[in-house]
């Protein structure tokens, strides 16, 4: 098994991830590992020489780059926040700020926008990945209600009057809770509070 540098007549190298074809000398040379860059190119008699990326720069993959990429912060103006710092081996990891979703994607999220409100009687469908898309509002399931316009409010179960020693004065809807009353008191017509003790 040849070790780099070695001649390659068919312009391909055995280990595509860790080696590359150098056309000038028609040889296969080692790539530099993540966190490093090429400080001296290979020749027929000497393999690639790699050096560690300087502070504030990185290379994520096996490479034959002569520079490292500059670390960049997540852009808060674009609604992004940082979840992990840049290191010599990876770029800064960003995500949408809470209450936002990714509206523009170019290999990674570049722009986040505010999640839409879900109207009363609905809630946002739970997604596998937070921040991946705008809210899709779905109706509250039977026996639940949600009484605000909000991007994040969840449907809550209707109050069970009997659990509190009360009786139902008005049934709950998708947008309002059950109204309960003391079993000994009639409900005045103007009362619309959730619970009367």
């Amino acid at each position: 098994q040849a070790v780099p540098p070695y001649a390659s007549e068919n312009q391909t190298c055995r280990d595509q991830e860790k080696e590359y074809y150098e056309p000038q000398h028609r040889i296969c040379c080692s790539r530099c590992p993540p966190g490093t860059y090429v400080s001296a190119k290979c020749s027929r008699i000497r393999d690639t020489v790699c050096a560690t990326c300087a502070e504030n720069s990185y290379n994520e993959h096996w490479n034959y780059l002569t520079i490292c990429q500059l670390c960049r912060p997540c852009d808060p103006v674009m609604g992004l926040e940082e979840i992990a710092p840049c290191t010599s081996k990876r770029k800064t990891q960003c995500r949408c700020q809470p209450g936002m979703f990714c509206a523009a994607w170019a290999l990674e999220c570049t722009h986040c926008e505010l999640l839409s409100d879900c109207p009363p009687g609905t809630e946002a469908e739970l997604k596998d990945e937070v921040g991946k898309g705008n809210n899709h509002c779905v109706p509250c399931k039977a026996g639940h209600f949600q009484n605000t316009s909000s991007p994040s409010a969840r449907c809550q179960p209707h109050t069970r009057c009997e659990n509190q020693g009360l009786v139902e004065a008005a049934p709950g809807t998708a947008q309002s809770d059950t109204t309960c009353k003391n079993p000994l008191e009639p409900l005045p017509p103007e009362m619309s509070g959730t619970m009367l003790m």
Partner: antibody, heavy 116, light 107 residues
């Protein structure tokens, strides 16, 4: 060479606020994150948050959100950490530190004592 | 938050001894772990970054190893100036978290 010089010790009463400064020199202030870390007596080191002076954006540890504010003045290459609604358990040494794969550079620390 | 559990919390050793300190992360942090030395009244000093890379100027008797969740700091031959407290830290994700320290004392 990189230097981070912090303001002097502070004694505060519960409920008050404290503002600690960290003056940076020996590097380009706007291109590196500055973090604040505290060490209470007999406690673990605790990361509070960072500021990126280039865009003056700060991000905080949820534990301190609403009580801590980190700011930076580019003209004087100085970062500030303000902690409000102080309580006795905030008695600690507060450090600023510049990050790169850990914290290679630290300020000398500022002792904040909270006592009635 | 990621917990960094360091052990032992203290140890007694003699000059020339080999000392091993371990740190366990509550979830995978890759190699994004640093080790620090701290002496009383002083700021911590970076010894190791990326789990195993010695910071410039750090003596070769200090070495780090590990990846994922289990990390080790080794002092191959303890010197008088090494009696101090040692901390691990993960910088894989925010919030950054630290181990609570290992105090290395003279036997």
């Amino acid at each position: 060479q990189v230097q981070l010089v912090q303001s002097g010790a502070e004694v505060k009463k519960p409920g008050q606020s404290v503002k600690v400064s960290c003056k940076a020199s020996g590097y380009t202030f706007t291109t590196y994150y500055l973090h604040w870390v505290r060490q209470a007596p007999g406690q673990c080191l605790e990361w509070m948050g960072w500021i990126y002076p280039g865009n003056v954006h700060a991000q905080y540890n949820e534990k301190f959100k609403g009580r801590v504010t980190i700011t930076a003045d580019k003209s004087t290459s100085t970062a500030y950490m303000e902690l409000s609604s102080l309580r006795s358990e905030d008695t600690a040494v507060y450090y600023c530190a510049r990050s790169w794969e850990g914290f290679p550079y630290w300020g000398q620390g500022t002792t904040v004592t909270v006592s009635s | 938050d990621i917990q960094m559990t360091q052990s032992p919390s203290s140890l007694s050793a003699s000059v020339g001894d080999r000392v091993t300190i371990t740190c366990k992360a509550s979830q995978n942090v890759g190699i994004n772990v640093a080790w620090y030395q701290q002496k009383p009244g002083k700021a911590p000093k970076l010894l190791i970054s990326s789990a195993s890379y010695r910071y410039s100027g750090v003596p070769s008797r200090f070495s780090g190893s590990g990846s994922g969740t289990d990390f080790t700091l080794t002092i191959s031959s303890l010197q008088p100036e090494d009696f101090a407290t040692y901390f691990c830290q993960q910088y894989d994700t925010y919030p950054f978290t630290f181990g609570c320290g290992t105090k290395v004392e003279i036997k």
